[in-house]
């Protein structure tokens, strides 16, 4: 509550997160022209990245383009990209949608379609939909431990969200355990009124707000966090503004004296931990 | 404007960026003693890294040290590093400028110069200038989409910079389209009074400031962002304080059962998105 | 000091860090069943990661699990994980402590112990203590250069912590050189009353607070930073809340057409740079 007699000071905060959980992924894998069912286990080193501070990312879905190499190839025949003669292709042109630079030649993409030849990482990435259901949909059951250390330098006061009395096997619950700082990812989504299974397909951004409203006067001292959750990306976003949350990264290697890469388009949830609040003292 | 009767509250912000563009890089490549022209395409997975939130990095230049292996070798003969006898070399000494630990021996670096032998990743990195012009100078034409979700928890008010009415093929312009949140990197530099081509060589830090001055009273409601740009690194910085912006990272691999690495010194622009402002309500 | 007549404004800040130093690491390496002493050099590309802005990480210790492959194997026999028959193992069960999914079979882990078989990256990570003393304990002598650019937009005032008059070979000292922004990691710990050698084993989080108390009135202008240091992780934390600071990451590679990985559990110090303060003007 607003005590006007108090000197108010904004919080200085540091956050540390630790994700736990393993996912079983089953997908179709094509090798040597033969498609078979692939089964693999993803642990934290596979689905999350060493990130700093106030954010952590959990991969929930992906599309792989394996064995790409720098060479010439027909570009992907997306809407409006097909050609019938070299006239349609402009040497040196970089279409923002394309993944390469045109050579000026129109070449066969497959038996029925021709597209402009490009210098690129080939074969170029197929513009296919993210797998549905999401490959790591079981990430819903992962948990995250959030450690938050706060400081009001003007009041020379420091505290943290985890107290010595807390139980390391708890799980946050709005009613039954509102001070537990271990959160099930699915529960975070439920609290925010969102469907994890749905968001996991294209990815998204989820805010975990930690509000510290601290009364630092000794006679009515109170300084504990309150957690709340809200989705930060726009689920109704127009296609042109890139809905969801994804990024591409590559694993590079050499084979037959040629540098190759596997391109991974990773979809997932970025969790932003937003810490705010004030410390007041007479 | 400052309405003193209003209860003011600082903004809570979350940012998501998406860079688009491909660069054509032409450089001399030496293989098996033969130097020839190398040409390659860099896409987002090659020149940017999965980074969190309020920063993104675009590589504009690089220096590679290929095929390094842990062994003994002469250190790089930079100013003051040459020796004529073992007396000048101190076993176990780590020169902060050097990349290894001295063995105590003075050995030939090339036909004319001798330097102290070190235990290091060898051959040690040559201290050569960053290529000029920058290898990915065409990054000037890349674009970045910035999505910003803001929240005034005390006023229970949330909004974002991208509105449903916006056009996904727009490009920000201070006069013609000041609300478009797709920015051409070259334009950002121009607005800040900086020369992209020049900064791209050594790298730098560019601030994108998003200022929200929100009047949340229903009768005169206004809450839209204002974008401005300023360079954050010191272009006049003394050499000893490491001008520009670069970092080193490595790609590790095994060859003939020996662990090797390619060391990349990546120069580039780090863009910091600085969101600030207040929401006021009667 | 609090000048009540002044219009106060919070600081907008951007940070850039640069770590310098090399570490010599000696450890037992087992190859082909033979254990011998391994000696290696770690430079910045080996012990730090390209991180954004207000945080940087220095690896001080590690545990490697080499040559893991996706297959079936007995899980690690930690407390309470052993079995005597298949009844104890539940097909499809994922123990949060385990690294895989149980097949339902109880199999020999070694000559004396049996554990539940799991589908996982095998052999599973041994839950061994972090090496003591820490492998990169010499990181105590690394230095970090911190560049901080600040802005008070309302007062249209910008400055930075590094002034043209500063000497690039200085080292911060609370008394003798309190404005130098090159810090020895060991000194940071000493200032915070912590033991680097001890924290390096399990890792930890260290706060570097930069306080700007700026009087921007021309007649009594003052705007320089004050540095202070405090440990942010809880050294007395219960085991269940994951004390210290570590994360796992993997290096993937192919051998005989099988995807393998080396899992690295990296312990280290995350340094959080916390910039705060106000600019006041009449």
């Amino acid at each position: 509550s607003d005590k006007l007699y108090q000197r108010k000071e904004p919080v200085i905060s540091s956050v540390h997160t630790k994700v736990k959980g393993i996912a079983e992924v089953t997908e179709n894998v094509t090798e040597g022209g033969v498609t078979k069912l692939g089964h693999s286990i993803f642990d934290t080193a596979d689905y999350t990245f060493p990130l700093q501070g106030n954010s952590f990312f959990v991969m929930t879905n992906y599309v792989k383009s394996e064995g790409q190499v720098q060479t010439l190839c027909p570009e992907y025949p997306r809407r409006g990209a097909q050609c019938s003669s070299d006239r349609r292709c402009k040497k040196g042109w970089m279409d923002p949608q394309s993944k390469g630079i045109q050579t000026g030649r129109c070449v066969p993409y497959d038996k029925t379609r021709k597209t402009c030849e490009v210098s690129a990482w080939c074969p170029t990435e197929e513009e296919k939909e993210a797998p549905r259901p999401a490959l790591l949909r079981s990430a819903e059951n992962f948990t995250v431990l959030i450690k938050n250390n706060i400081h009001f330098p003007g009041h020379n006061y420091t505290t943290r969200n985890i107290l010595p009395t807390m139980n390391g096997s708890c799980t946050f619950h709005k009613t039954w355990d509102p001070q537990c700082s271990i959160f099930r990812l699915g529960d975070i989504f439920q609290e925010a009124g969102e469907n994890f299974t749905e968001v996991a397909v294209q990815g998204g951004i989820m805010g975990i707000e930690i509000y510290w409203d601290c009364n630092l006067d000794s006679w009515s001292h109170h300084c504990r966090p309150r957690y709340s959750f809200r989705r930060l990306d726009d689920k109704n976003m127009d296609e042109s503004f890139v809905p969801g949350y994804n990024f591409r990264y590559a694993k590079y290697y050499k084979e037959n004296n040629v540098e190759k890469r596997t391109l991974i388009k990773a979809f997932g949830i970025r969790f932003d931990i937003l810490v705010f609040g004030t410390g007041g003292k007479f | 404007s400052d309405k003193l009767y209003q209860r003011k509250e600082p903004v809570i912000s979350s940012v998501h960026t998406k860079v688009k563009g491909i660069a054509e890089v032409t450089e001399n490549v030496t293989e098996g003693g033969v130097t020839k022209l190398g040409h390659s395409i860099f896409d987002t997975a090659d020149y940017t890294f999965p980074l969190q939130g309020n920063s993104f990095f675009v590589m504009t230049n690089y220096v590679k040290s290929e095929g390094q292996v842990q062994t003994l070798c002469p250190e790089y003969p930079r100013r003051g590093a040459q020796c004529s006898s073992d007396r000048r070399c101190k076993k176990g000494w780590m020169d902060p400028q050097s990349k290894g630990i001295q063995t105590g021996r003075c050995v030939p670096y090339d036909k004319t110069r001798k330097t102290c032998e070190v235990s290091a990743w060898c051959p040690t990195e040559e201290e050569k200038e960053a290529p000029r012009p920058a290898l990915l100078r065409s990054a000037e034409n890349f674009t970045v989409l910035i999505k910003n979700n803001i929240h005034f928890p005390g006023h229970n008010y949330t909004t974002r910079n991208i509105l449903p009415t916006m056009n996904g093929s727009c490009t920000f312009h201070k006069t013609w389209d000041p609300q478009c949140s797709i920015f051409r990197l070259g334009d950002i530099f121009q607005e800040a009074g900086e020369n992209f081509t020049e900064v791209a060589v050594q790298g730098g830090i560019m601030g994108i400031e998003i200022y929200w001055d929100c009047n949340l009273d229903s009768w005169s409601h206004h809450c839209r962002p204002r974008y401005s740009f300023r360079r954050l690194d010191d272009k006049n910085m003394d050499e000893s304080f490491v001008p520009g912006y670069n970092f080193r990272y490595a790609k590790y691999y095994k060859e003939n059962n020996v662990e090797k690495r390619t060391l990349i010194k990546a120069f580039g622009i780090r863009f910091d998105i600085l969101v600030f402002g207040t929401g006021g309500k009667f | 000091s609090d000048k009540l007549y002044q219009r106060k404004e919070p600081v907008i800040s951007s940070v850039h860090t640069k770590v310098k130093g090399i570490a010599e690491v000696t450890e037992n390496v087992t190859e082909g069943g033979v254990t011998k002493l391994g000696h290696s050099i770690f430079d910045t590309a080996d012990y730090t990661f390209p991180l954004q802005g207000n945080s940087f990480f220095v690896m001080t210790n590690y545990v490697k699990s080499e040559g893991q492959v996706q297959t079936l194997c007995p899980e690690y026999p930690r407390r309470g994980a052993q079995c005597s028959s298949d009844r104890r193992c539940k097909k499809g069960w994922m123990d949060p402590q385990s690294k895989g999914i149980q097949t339902g079979r109880c199999v020999p882990y070694d000559k004396t112990r049996k554990t539940c078989e799991v589908s996982a990256w095998c052999p599973t990570e041994e839950e061994k203590e972090a090496p003591r003393p820490a492998l990169l304990r010499s990181a105590e002598n690394f230095t970090v250069l911190i560049k901080n650019n600040i802005h008070f937009p309302g007062h249209n005032y910008t400055t930075r912590n590094i002034l043209p008059t500063m000497n690039g070979s200085c080292t911060f000292h609370k008394t003798w050189d309190p404005q130098c922004s090159i810090f020895r990691l060991g000194d940071i710990f000493q200032e915070a009353g912590e033991n680097f050698t001890e924290v390096a084993v399990q890792g930890g989080i260290m706060g570097i607070e930069i306080y700007w108390d700026c009087n921007l009135d021309s007649w009594s202008h003052h705007c320089r930073p004050r540095y202070s240091f405090r440990r942010l992780d809880d050294k007395n934390m219960d085991e269940s809340f994951v004390p210290g600071y570590n994360f796992r990451y993997a290096k993937y590679y192919k051998e005989n057409n099988v995807e393998k990985r080396t899992l690295i559990k990296a312990f280290g110090i995350r340094f959080d740079i916390l910039v705060f303060g106000t600019g006041g003007k009449f």
């Epitope: 064995g67 790409q68 190499v69 720098q70 060479t71 010439l72 190839c73 040497k91 040196g92 630079i101 045109q102 050579t103 000026g104 030649r105 030849e117 210098s119 080939c122 074969p123 084979e255 037959n256 040629v258 190759k260 | 054509e24 032409t26 020839k36 022209l37 040409h39 | -």
Partner: nanobody, 120 residues
Framework: AVQLVESGGGLVQAGGSLRLSCAAS????????MAWYRQAPGKQRELVAD???????NYADTVNGRFTISRDNVRNTVYLQMNGLRPEDTAAYYC??????????????WGQGTQVTVSS
Amino acid sequence: AVQLVESGGGLVQAGGSLRLSCAASGNFFRVNTMAWYRQAPGKQRELVADITRGDRTNYADTVNGRFTISRDNVRNTVYLQMNGLRPEDTAAYYCYAVIELGVLEPRDYWGQGTQVTVSS
């Protein structure tokens, strides 16, 4: 000038094997896709197999499982290992490559051809 030089053709009995090779020489920037085509007397030239710079292969249905295409990127050479040869494989075999003379300057190049004759 850029040249493709084939070798390895000849006369072989049905069920036998041959290995064709084709090397690109001259001054150029990069060899991209390489392929083998064949033309039997009185017939049209047809694709036998091709291989990208990234070693992705594609075979005509008639040779799939019997022929193997491979390449050596250091020597800019493509090979065709032909096992289980049949009389209907008799033809002139032509090497084909997409070669960039300079950056973004691709040209299609053909070899002179090498004769393969399979007797029954």
